[in-house]
């Protein structure tokens, strides 16, 4: 570092340095002046600063502070923005895959139900996507609409394939009968439970990430108060007025100033910590029926089971519906025959099994681990900013806001500061309105995250299905037994080999099982052909 220059009788040094900030010299005195008009860099003697220079320094200080704040949050901001986008896209891909699986199941097993089934399935999954993105749609209504729409087609195409055209105006009656007679058993209710729980959690997860971005953006673009601007100017630039170009502010002094300037922002800390911990709790609970990937990719199987359930009870249903829908005279066509092996074997019921490699679930946990490294982000900001701005090491030979000192004393500096503005007053003013608003939003999301209906207090037994039945055991009503179909479990392998295949799109024609007319139980459904 250069040796301290001799006293500057001409302000040449100050003039030269000020030109870095402001071309031209009209604002800089040629020789030291009393500086009685100065409001921030109050001189102890003659000074080389003018009021205009002081204003320029204040503007520079505030701009630099904003820039420092933005660079402090850059990594965190990028982490959340990137993950919010990645998860949103991944959820859309899961929905697309789930739709394609379901369409493939219809195409392979019930070709007579297409294209109507494709249309209803498409509408259902469109609603799923909209719900995840925040639309005001009721999940139960979505599921009811799917089954209400499917049943008339199943009834007229599968159960009574020979029904004459004159009998085809009974759709509304069939839609009503579907609910009244519980023609699909408990499957619609099961799907409602699984889909609503998993989508609710997915939706709140995305909402929470987007709020995280909003929090960072808010604090990133804070406009600092005039008092803060004065404190920063005093710390960073007032030494220039005395020709002390190489002197750095004392570290302890910087901490005092930053705590004053950042008092409002630091108030976010408590709610930010809670936000990350609540998000972690949510993510930890996102498995089984709380994991949309698991639920949606297994939906085709449950829908298939629900149709088999209808087929099994076709005889009984046809008679009842014939009376209910007042077309009994046309009920002479025999129901289509379905071989016994398509019926549900209640003793081998199993829930769709999932093999996880790098799935969304591992990606979520990875995000939480990274976020947890930013848990003290707001409380650490004052320290971060001081460590990334010019400060003197060890608080020796440094600027304390008034003069060059051998050693920094907080008490002396505080006394000096009181002459200009009360640091305590600055802290007492409370946070900016925008900070108060973002705190309210954080409180709200934290409340939502905490009150999410998640499995708490006990780990779900892996041998139990969603309704609490053991595999192979059903409820009292044998006809309403629910679960995965067939003599084994359906495997959905590597649900999404997450990042490597993010943009992968599965068309119906490429969907698993299209090479043969078989039920999904005969195929191992593989999302990607490894």
């Amino acid at each position: 570092q250069p040796p301290p220059p001799p006293p500057d009788a001409t302000c040449h040094q100050v003039r030269s340095f000020f030109q870095r900030l402001q071309p031209g010299l009209k604002w800089v005195p040629e020789t030291p002046v009393p500086g009685s008009d100065l409001q921030v860099c109050l001189p102890k003697g003659p000074t080389c600063c003018s009021r205009k220079m002081e204003e320029k320094y204040q503007l520079t200080a505030r701009l630099n502070m904003e820039q420092l704040l933005q660079s402090a949050s850059m990594e965190l901001k990028f982490l959340i923005i990137q993950n919010a986008a990645v998860f949103q896209e991944a959820f859309e891909i899961v929905v697309r895959h789930a739709k394609n699986y379901t369409n493939a199941m219809f195409k392979n097993n019930y070709p007579s139900l297409t294209p109507q089934a494709f249309e209803f399935v498409g509408e259902f999954f469109t609603d799923v996507s909209l719900y995840i993105l925040g639309s005001d749609i009721n999940v139960d209504d979505m599921v009811n609409e799917l089954f209400d729409s499917l049943f008339p087609v199943i009834y007229t195409q599968l159960m009574n394939p020979g029904l004459p055209d004159s009998a085809l105006d009974i759709n509304e009656c069939l839609r009503g009968a579907r609910r009244d007679l519980k023609v699909f058993g408990n499957f619609p209710k099961l799907i409602m439970t699984q889909v609503s729980k998993s989508l609710q959690v997915t939706r709140i997860f995305l909402q929470a990430l987007n709020l995280g971005i909003e929090v960072i953006n808010t604090t990133d673009h804070l406009k600092f108060s005039k008092d803060c601007g004065r404190m920063l100017t005093r710390m960073w630039y007032c030494s220039y007025c005395q020709g002390l170009m190489m002197v750095k502010p004392c570290g302890g002094y910087c901490n005092v100033v930053m705590q004053g300037c950042m008092a409002g922002v630091v108030e976010i800390d408590k709610y930010w910590r809670e936000y990350i911990l609540s998000l972690e709790e949510l993510v930890n609970g996102m498995y089984r029926i709380y994991d949309m990937e698991n639920v949606l990719l297994g939906l085709f199987s449950t829908i298939h089971d629900s149709i088999q359930y209808v087929q099994k009870n076709a005889g009984k249903l046809t008679t009842t519906i014939g009376k209910l829908c007042a077309h009994s005279q046309q009920r002479q066509y025999r129901s289509a025959y379905y071989p016994e092996d398509l019926f549900i074997d209640k003793k081998v019921l199993k829930v769709a099994h999932v093999e996880h490699e790098e799935t969304l679930s591992s990606r979520r946990r990875e995000l939480i681990q990274k976020l947890k490294s930013f848990i003290s982000f707001y409380s650490a900001l004052p320290g971060y900013i001081c460590s990334h701005s010019p400060v003197a090491e060890n608080d020796t030979l440094c600027w304390n806001g008034q003069e060059l000192v051998e050693r920094y004393s907080q008490k002396a500096a505080r006394n000096g500061m009181k002459n200009q503005f009360n640091l305590h007053e600055l802290k007492m003013k409370g946070p900016e309105p925008v900070v108060s608003q973002i705190i309210d939003k954080l409180k709200h999301i934290n409340q939502l995250l905490r009150t999410m209906s998640m499995p708490k207090g006990r780990v779900l037994d892996k041998n139990l299905d969603e309704e609490g039945f053991e595999s192979g055991d059903c409820g009292d009503d044998e006809d309403e037994c629910i679960g995965g179909s067939g003599d084994g479990m359906i495997k959905v392998k590597n649900q999404l080999r997450f990042l490597a295949e993010l943009a992968y799109d599965l068309d119906v024609d490429d969907a698993p099982g299209n090479s043969q007319q078989a039920t999904p139980k005969d195929n191992e459904i593989s999302t990607f052909h490894n």
Epitope: R20, L21, T60, N64, L68, Y237, K248, H388, S389, P390
Partner: nanobody, 116 residues
Framework: QVQLVQSGGGLVQPGGSLRLSCAAS????????MSWVRQAPGKGLEWIGS???????YYNPSLKSRVTISRDNSKNTLYLQMNTLRAEDTATYYC??????????WGQGTLVTVSS
């Protein structure tokens, strides 16, 4: 610890030119604005000019016509080229890192003497 190590300088004939180098280490050189400053014997510091991380430059108007500042981010090195030297250019030349519009780290200084 941030380091700025200067080289070049020495005795130069009036009308001649000088090229000084400043090798930076232990910080992200390409993220910082860098400056050259000089101090004539018995005088105060004088800002010569600065270069942004992007490579754009701005100079002290009184020296602008004779000075070129450049940088090579791949080598973490800053350069000062000064032409048509006069006796009054005799000074110790310093490179400095700019942080928050202040010079927070300085090179060790290089004495340039312009004399015949």
């Amino acid at each position: 610890q941030v380091q700025l190590v200067q080289s070049g300088g020495g005795l130069v004939q009036p009308g001649g030119s000088l090229r000084l180098s400043c090798a930076a280490s232990y910080f992200d050189f390409d993220s910082y604005e860098m400056s050259w400053v000089r101090q004539a014997p018995g005088k105060g510091l004088e800002w010569i000019g600065s270069i942004y991380h992007s490579g754009s430059t701005y100079y002290n108007p009184s020296l602008k016509s004779r000075v070129t500042i450049s940088r090579d981010n791949s080598k973490n090195t800053l350069y000062l080229q000064m032409n048509t030297l006069r006796a009054e250019d005799t000074a110790t030349y310093y490179c400095a890192r700019v942080n928050m519009d202040r010079f927070d780290y300085w090179g060790q200084g290089t004495l340039v003497t312009v004399s015949s």
